[in-house]
Interface confidence: low
């Protein structure tokens, strides 16, 4: 908008770094071969890389991930009675960020 | 996958709370007419509800929203060089969030 | 360190043509973002701005008095040229050049010349 | 063609007193443009005091400060030093970068 200009704060870049993110756990990181279950909880939080960079041939990307596994539960409904498993799902989360040109080949750790 | 549980820890819900997200600030918020142009900083931090609910029923929705005005930078290129102007780009934080009913409409503040 | 000096004629005749060089040190005009600018001061009145030259040679002057000026640089030897044609003695003021630069915010002149006084007179 | 208005034209002060200049931009032009201060003192050249509406060039204390925003724009000299006491002219440009002056405001002593 072209609004007054007087209350306005200059806007600050939202840099590239790792930032709190929701993770929906989708039953198929569960068991792609069955549908009638359900997941406990239906989402985590993550640490994810995000924000933006300079220019537009370069990237925010991750530098250094880890894996993290956690445990959930499946929980199966038999003869409407729920039955609970154990599950685990492993996790990814960003450690470190950087802007990379877009053609680099993203790092694994 | 259903692997080893030996170092799995618990999973805990991302509950239903505001988090800081990346924004990108698009051309079309400045100027729908033209697109020779730049916008700095091209993304920005704002704070929006995110996380999970109890059941399939209910969403995490604001409850309570805030209109922010920033001042960005549209950049230009007028017969080779930058132009700077300024331009007012209106972001929308989430300052409270709650798990509601689906069908609830969404409140504005 | 940045310097400018100006040089040329302190008397000019009405309807000739008045020649000025700015000779300047410590930047590069074929640096990207950097110009030079003339300025002039008739006394006792205020600042009026009257051309710009930039890196990449592109050329800008002041919409009123475009049709007598015509400004230009030798970056080899760190020089811009203004020439005013068709002089009157409302011309007559001090002129300065000025290092101007396009970075960001940046439309200013930081850098200036001490100025030469020109006097339009027969 | 943008139009910078100064007011007042002088400002009569004592060393130690707040100064407030005023520039105001008139222009068609729906997008605002940066404005710049100098100070100029007799027998000299311009000196380069704010650029960026706000922001202090090299060297300059920080008595001095700019603000403003839209059309009205101030340059603020919070304790005037008897070094102050100059001529001084707000610039802006516009979007073919041809620049103006404003018609200055002199700041003497009282």
């Known amino acids: 908008s072209l609004g007054s200009l007087t209350i306005a704060e200059p806007a600050m870049i939202a840099e590239c770094k790792t930032r709190t993110e929701v993770f929906e756990i989708s039953r198929r990181l569960i068991d792609r071969t069955n549908a009638n279950f359900l997941v406990w909880p239906p989402c985590v939080e993550v640490q994810r890389c995000s924000g933006c960079c300079n220019n537009r041939n370069v990237q925010c990307r991750p530098t250094q991930v880890q894996l993290r596994p956690v445990q959930v539960r499946k929980i199966e409904i038999v003869r409407k009675k729920p039955i609970f498993k154990k599950a685990t799902v492993t996790l990814e989360d960003h450690l470190a960020c950087k802007c990379e040109t877009v053609a680099a080949a993203r790092p694994v750790t | 996958s259903l692997g080893s549980l030996t170092i799995a820890e618990p999973a805990m819900i991302a509950e239903c709370k505001t988090r800081t997200e990346v924004f990108e600030i698009s051309r079309r918020l400045i100027d729908r007419t033209n697109a020779n142009f730049l916008v700095w900083p091209p993304c920005v931090e704002v704070q929006r509800c995110s996380g999970c609910c109890n059941n399939r029923n209910v969403q995490c929705r604001p409850t309570q929203v805030q209109l922010r005005p920033v001042q960005v930078r549209k950049i230009e290129i007028v017969r080779k060089k930058p132009i700077f102007k300024k331009a007012t780009v209106t972001l929308e934080d989430h300052l409270a969030c709650k798990c509601e009913t689906v069908a609830a409409a969404r409140p504005v503040t | 360190e940045v310097t400018l000096r100006e040089s040329g004629p302190a008397l000019v005749k009405p309807t000739q043509t008045l020649t000025l060089t700015c000779t300047f040190s410590g930047f590069s005009l074929s640096t990207y973002g950097m110009g030079v600018g003339w300025i002039r001061q008739p006394p006792g009145k205020a600042l009026e701005w009257l051309a710009n030259?930039?890196?990449?040679?592109?050329?800008y002057y002041n919409p009123s008095l475009k049709n007598r000026l015509t400004i230009s640089k030798d970056t080899s030897k760190n020089q811009v040229v203004l020439t005013m044609t068709n002089m009157d003695p409302v011309d007559t003021a001090t002129y300065y050049c000025a290092r101007i630069e396009s970075v960001w915010t940046r439309y200013d002149f930081d850098y200036w010349g001490q100025g030469t006084m020109v006097t339009v007179s027969s | 063609e943008i139009v910078l208005t100064q007011s007042p034209g002088t400002l009569s002060l004592s060393p130690g007193e707040r100064a407030t200049l005023s520039c105001e931009r008139s222009?068609?032009?729906?997008?605002?443009?940066?404005v710049s201060w100098y100070q100029q003192k007799p027998g000299q050249a311009p000196r380069l005091v704010i650029y960026?509406?706000?922001q202090r060039a090299s060297g300059i204390p920080d008595r001095f400060s700019g603000s403003g925003s839209g059309t009205d724009f101030t340059l603020t000299i919070s304790r005037l030093e008897p070094e102050d006491f100059a001529v001084y002219y707000c610039q802006s440009y516009d979007i073919d970068i041809d620049i103006t002056f404003g018609g200055g405001t002199k700041v003497e002593i009282k």
């Open positions: 222009s068609g032009d729906i997008w605002q443009t940066y």
């Open positions: 030259i930039w890196w990449d040679d592109d050329k």
């Open positions: 960026g509406d706000d």
